[in-house]
Interface confidence: low
Amino acid sequence: FVRTKIDTTENLLNTEVHSSPAQRWSMQVPPEVSAEAGDAAVLPCTFTHPHRHYDGPLTAIWRAGEPYAGPQVFRCAAARGSELCQTALSLHGRFRLLGNPRRNDLSLRVERLALADDRRYFCRVEFAGDVHDRYESRHGVRLHVTAAPRIVNISVLPSPAHAFRALCTAEGEPPPALAWSGPALGNSLAAVRSPREGHGHLVTAELPALTHDGRYTCTAANSLGRSEASVYLFRFHGASGAST
């Protein structure tokens, strides 16, 4: 399921314009496209240009993160007069040009979406024949990837004074709420750490002191689903070890 905020009835809304109004460079992209992890998404991008009948060599580029300087995720080149844009780069083989650059369409399909794909993408076209010109979307399209929760790590770790603490890390978008349950706990919402830089979809909850032996279950939930995982604490009484 893919949602795209776009309305072709208003040119200036999502259009970035350069040059004179009569014949100008412009790029039309929606501000946001949403899709679920595992699915595919289409990033629309169309353009106009002032070089009326240009049929020389062209290059289509998509980059991620930021315009002009972000890493390229896709690049293809079309020879003079050709409508075939030969792929030169497709990061992890998951990016494929849907549009025809000769027909002013750079739309890109992204396969097998992951949470890491949730970022802003920028399309660019370069002419390199008798005309040398280029234009790049400055504001780009935000790809918003949603995902049901997944617990990526659950563990019991030693704490000072022969105590133990439990950590549960989950990912999802929207970021999942985490809850611990276990012996003498009932249902505890535990301390949730802020997502770490560069790991915006990861949430960690800690149980700082495990006071009883038994099974401790971490549940992660968001609007798309829930997931749970358990660890077991069994202390060898009289010793300082634990079995998990």
């Epitope: 208003e10 809304l13 930021e66 400055r138």
Partner: antibody, heavy 122, light 107 residues
Framework: EVQLLESGGGLVQPGGSLRLSCAAS????????MSWVRQAPGKGLEWVST????????YYADSVKGRFTISRDNSKNTLYLQMNSLRAEDTAVYYC???????????????WGQGTMVTVSS | DIQMTQSPSSVSASVGDRVTITCRAS??????LAWYQQKPGKAPKLLIY???SLQSGVPSRFSGSGSGTDFTLTISSLQPEDFATYYC?????????FGQGTKLEIK
């Protein structure tokens, strides 16, 4: 001269309505997204709403969604904010602001009006 | 929503001082950050956009830097007219959000 001039503020009771206007001059009004930004007394700035150049797209802060309506009349170079079901927490100076670029997803607000005070009180 | 956090909330300085104000975003906003100056009873004035571009007519003693989540506004040599409140604002995504402001006062 490039400028924005707000009007329509005043004292209104909770649950009441007001319509703010912002008259633009000195630039091609229809080419730019316009926004309303407010500032409660002694507080910081809060974005309220944005409308795209042609008026097709409108966006609102959660705090005003369903109560406020942004609109524009490009033939009159005027931006509006219709405020219904007003609450005490809507008390603020309301500024209209122009986006720096012609794309709706613009970087910043490069032109601001002088502001109009809205007081919601019984 | 993206939260913008400015520090410090207030700073005292003297004419001629170099002053730095920082702004942190709760998530990566690339370079989509603006800085504004506001004086009491007046509308905000744009100083810097896309993190480091100086708005036309703004003195060159103002500069901006940063990308991602951490940004800085620097005033290289304070002038008497610079004492005001400064706000950062992200335009990476709607809702646009502002920092809480940094009040620059005379020492």
């Amino acid at each position: 001269e490039v400028q924005l001039l707000e009007s329509g503020g005043g004292l209104v009771q909770p649950g009441g309505s007001l319509r703010l206007s912002c008259a633009a001059s000195g630039f091609t009004f229809s080419s730019y997204a316009m926004s309303w930004v407010r500032q409660a007394p002694g507080k910081g700035l809060e974005w309220v709403s944005t409308i795209s150049g042609g008026g097709v797209y409108t966006y609102y802060a959660d705090s005003v969604k369903g109560r406020f309506t942004i609109s524009r009349d490009n033939s009159k170079n005027t931006l509006y904010l219709q405020m219904n079901s007003l609450r005490a927490e809507d008390t603020a100076v309301y500024y209209c602001a122009k986006a720096i670029g012609s794309s709706w997803y613009s970087d910043a607000f490069d032109l601001w009006g002088q502001g109009t005070m809205v007081t919601v009180s019984s | 929503d993206i939260q913008m956090t400015q520090s410090p909330s207030s700073v005292s300085a003297s004419v001629g001082d170099r002053v730095t104000i920082t702004c942190r975003a709760s998530q990566d906003i690339s370079s989509w950050l603006a800085w504004y100056q506001q004086k009491p009873g007046k509308a905000p004035k744009l100083l810097i956009y896309v993190a480091s571009s100086l708005q036309s007519g703004v003195p060159s003693r103002f500069s901006g830097s940063g990308s991602g989540t951490d940004f800085t506004l620097t005033i290289s040599s304070l002038q008497p007219e610079d004492f005001a409140t400064y706000y950062c604002q992200q335009s990476y995504s709607i809702p646009y959000t502002f920092g809480q402001g940094t009040k620059l006062e005379i020492k």
